[in-house]
């Protein structure tokens, strides 16, 4: 089993639409069970997206390049919640996700109608299959929710920004 | 054949130390976060830590955390866990033991033979 | 963490029965829970994961079912070689916990 998520990190406006994109490939002949699933940061990151992340933090990532602060830490210390889930046809949402615009397309791709502010973290396309127990199950990709302020280009030059037309 | 073969154990006094290695062969060492689980004298499976797959991730359970430390050798496929100050809940039967997928959220598919850890007086 | 119980420290059945083990956890695990078989003097065994998907090599009198919070571990005839440990596991969030086991005695 391969699991691809193209995009590591993406930036979306706040009550726009966004589709977080999922690639997978398996020997197995079953079909797959895709999941998506969120789960928010170990600490916040709009700080440091603002430039005003610790020291601590910053020394700590700087002497181990394998390790972020805001993405590495145990779920048990984070939130950790199923967005969607897809079986054949049928697309469940998570409980903390029903009565939102949210859906799975194309296989794999999460669609989210409306971007709310509790919508920043990271984001996992899990997928399961019968008789595929190797490889690489799940990918994540990395969504930053912004308001309109006019400095987004100086904000987060790292990301790449996409703004739906309303 | 995926194969895990630790050692290490014994028997060791409250507040001395012990080293644990964990061979491994047939995968690719290097792409698998590997997990350390103890199962205790009641048969209760508890994990006891588990490292990334390049070695720069540790996670550790409070019961366990400043006390032990687990890391790896990816030139030797090997992977260890250092305890210290051991107290007689530590005694257990130590497993290494890794997942099926080299990265994602999936069960243990492969466990070692164990090594026993006593802690007495 | 998430606490995975079992509620059934041994059950005893006969060859030739069907033996059903439940796990309960404490929060929803969706469909992420394991299976495993321990015989005596062995280490565990996989034999079911997410739920309700058989390891490769298990036996299909072996199978599982449930979401959510609550699991159900099937054997549909139990053999003699059946006598074991069975225990669950969450593999939804880390850290991964196992309940406290359920041992199959054979009468």
């Known amino acids: 089993l391969q699991v691809t998520v193209p995009d590591k990190k993406k930036v979306a406006m706040l009550f726009q639409p966004t589709v977080l994109r999922c690639h997978f490939s398996t020997s197995s002949h079953q079909p797959a069970v895709v999941q998506w699933k969120f789960k928010s940061y170990c600490q916040d990151r709009m700080g440091e997206s603002l430039g005003m992340s610790s020291t601590r933090a910053q020394s700590l990532s700087k002497r181990n390049l394998e390790w972020d602060p805001y993405l590495d830490c145990l779920d048990s210390r984070r939130t950790v919640r199923v967005v969607a889930s897809k079986q054949g046809s049928t697309v469940t949402l998570g409980d903390f996700y029903r009565g939102r615009e949210i859906t799975i397309v194309h296989d794999a791709d999460l669609q989210i109608g409306k971007l709310m502010w509790g919508d920043s973290g990271l984001y996992y396309c899990i997928i399961t299959t019968p008789d595929d127990l190797e490889g690489k199950n799940e990918d994540s990709v990395e969504l930053l929710v912004l308001g309109r302020t006019g400095l987004l280009a100086d904000l987060l030059p790292s990301f790449a920004v996409e703004i739906m037309p309303e | 054949e995926v194969k895990m073969v630790e050692s290490g154990g014994g028997l060791v006094q409250p507040g001395g130390s012990l080293k644990l290695s964990c061979a491994t062969s047939g995968f690719t060492f290097s792409d698998y976060y590997m997990y350390w689980v103890r199962q205790t004298p009641e048969k209760r499976l508890e994990w006891v830590a588990y490292?990334?797959?390049?070695?720069?991730?540790?996670y550790y359970p409070d019961t366990v955390k400043g006390r032990f430390t687990i890391s790896r050798d990816n030139a030797k496929n090997t992977l260890y866990l250092q305890m210290s100050r051991l107290k007689s809940e530590d005694t257990a039967m130590y497993y290494c033991?890794?997942?099926?997928?080299?990265?994602?959220?999936?069960?243990?598919?492969?466990w070692g033979q164990g090594t026993l850890v006593t802690v007495s007086a | 963490d998430i606490v995975m119980t079992q509620s059934h420290k041994f059950m005893s059945t006969s060859v030739g029965d069907r033996v059903s083990i439940t796990c309960k956890a404490s929060?929803?695990?969706?469909?992420?829970v394991a299976w495993y078989q321990q015989k005596p003097g062995q280490s565990p065994k996989l034999l079911i994961y997410s739920a309700s998907y058989r390891y490769t090599g298990v036996p299909d009198r072996f199978t599982g079912s449930g979401s959510g919070t609550d699991f159900t571990f099937t054997i549909s005839s139990v053999q003699a070689e059946d006598l074991a440990v069975y225990y669950c596991?969450?593999?939804?969030?880390?850290?991964?916990?196992f309940g406290g086991g359920t041992k199959l005695e054979i009468k």
């Open positions: 596991q969450q593999h939804y969030s880390t850290p991964y916990t």
């Open positions: 929060q929803d695990v969706s469909t992420a």
């Open positions: 490292i990334s797959n390049g070695g720069g991730s540790t």
């Open positions: 033991a890794r997942q099926g997928y080299y990265y994602g959220s999936s069960p243990f598919a492969y």
